[in-house]
């Protein structure tokens, strides 16, 4: 069954999806849609990339990671309860029936008046890769932790770690990216 992600009303929601390009810049088309992945396409498309760039997007939906390195995780800005539901990430790998498709369930909770959570000390142990946050200036990149490569078979593991995405939301609000490659 699909992996579940949570966010609060008014926050940014983060839905992870990754692939490993065959070579740097050798991208494959990816689409994100609202609703479960159909047999060939992506449902009601909210964002689409081609071999070069993001070529279609709708307001509030964007890729905050480096999609040129295979991070096609979706950020949904300022979510409302209506954003709850299933989302489809489809990696349209060329060839016969090579598509990778992932159904992710987004659960939006009413906003709570609680202090923002802080980064936990064991965060780097859970994520093998490089994680950065970016401030508002070009020189404000801070390495939070170093962590092996993520491939398609490891997506679910990463997804499970991010399941309760309060932390992910805080990172995304400050421009966090999980870098691939």
């Amino acid at each position: 069954s699909e992996v579940e992600y949570r966010a609060e009303v008014g926050q940014n929601a983060y839905l992870p999806c990754f692939y490993t390009p065959a070579a740097p810049g050798n991208l494959v088309p990816v689409c994100w849609g609202k609703g479960a992945c159909p047999v060939f396409e992506c449902g009601n498309v909210v964002l689409r990339t081609d071999e070069r760039d993001v070529n279609y997007w709708t307001s509030r939906y964007w890729l905050n990671g480096d999609f040129r390195k295979g991070d096609v995780s979706l950020t949904i800005e300022n979510v409302t309860l209506a954003d709850s539901g299933i989302y489809c990430c489809r990696i349209q790998i060329p060839g016969i029936m090579n598509d990778e498709k992932f159904n992710l369930k987004l659960v939006i909770k009413p906003a709570k008046v609680t202090p923002a959570p802080t980064l936990q000390r064991d965060f780097t142990a859970a994520f093998p890769r490089m994680l950065t946050t970016r401030g508002h200036g070009p020189a404000e990149t801070q390495t939070l932790g170093s962590l092996p490569d993520i491939n398609l078979t490891q997506i679910s593991t990463l997804a499970n770690e991010l399941r309760d995405s309060r932390l992910a939301n805080d990172l995304r609000d400050s421009g966090a990216t999980i870098r691939i490659g």
Partner: antibody
């Protein structure tokens, strides 16, 4: 107005090859999955190939390795290359547009082109 | 592969009468609460025409006398009052899994 026009059908000997074309107009071709569906004389419908908007390819076992579907978004066209043709491939071949956002069912069809495989 | 079995193979109906066509799938075509089953109409010498998608949604431009129902493995196309232009062959089709498959068809003929 959405239009799909097939061409390239004809008589071919067993073991031969044929390339069918489907010229599309009236919609943003690149956003849609396209399929080929065939109908043998007096028989039912059989799906034979699909290509997604992103270029992923899908075939049933009956034609896998013999048929190749492709698309040229710049020319608003879809193609079906048919090799190692058999008598049982004789049929009217329809080009069909997959429903936007899904692709697995067909909201527009061409009028079909007849392929006859016979010696 | 998902096998679709349509019944009856031929249905003889008088104009103005109700026609009920059946399609049974060899396995469920339910997917996240949606039944991935379609119905098409085909007249001699013409291409098929989409009538119903996702089991019960009537395609734009299709007369209201056509309706679809069912879930899981059992589906029905109903024509509430047959008109002369409705005499044709009707096919069901699943979009749950590759390969996409069609039923063998039901021919609706004038009684």
């Amino acid at each position: 107005e959405v239009q799909l026009v097939e061409s390239g059908g004809g008589l071919v000997q067993p073991g031969g090859s044929l390339r069918l074309s489907c010229a599309a107009s009236g919609f943003t071709f690149s956003r849609y999955a396209m399929s080929w569906v065939r109908q043998a004389p007096g028989k039912g419908l059989e799906w034979v190939a699909a290509i997604s908007s992103g270029g992923s390819l899908y075939y049933p076992d009956s034609v896998k390795g013999r048929f190749t579907i492709s698309r040229d978004n710049a020319k608003n066209s879809c193609y079906l290359q048919m090799n190692s043709l058999r008598a049982e491939d004789t049929a009217v071949y329809y080009c069909a547009r997959g429903r936007e956002a899904d692709g697995g069912y067909f909201d527009y069809w061409g009028q079909g082109t007849l392929v006859t495989v016979s010696s | 592969d998902i096998v679709l079995t349509q019944s009856p193979a031929t249905l003889s109906v008088s104009p103005g009468e109700r026609a009920t066509l059946s399609c049974r799938a060899s396995e469920s075509v339910e997917y996240y609460g949606t039944s991935l089953m379609q119905w098409y109409q085909q007249k001699p010498g013409q291409a098929p025409r989409l009538l119903i998608y996702a089991a019960s949604n009537v395609e734009s431009g299709v007369p209201a006398r056509f309706s679809g129902s069912g879930s899981g493995t059992d589906f029905t196309l109903t024509i509430s009052s047959l008109q002369s232009e409705d005499f044709a062959v009707y096919y069901c089709q699943q979009s749950m899994k590759v390969p996409l498959t069609f039923g063998g068809g039901t021919k609706v003929e004038i009684k």
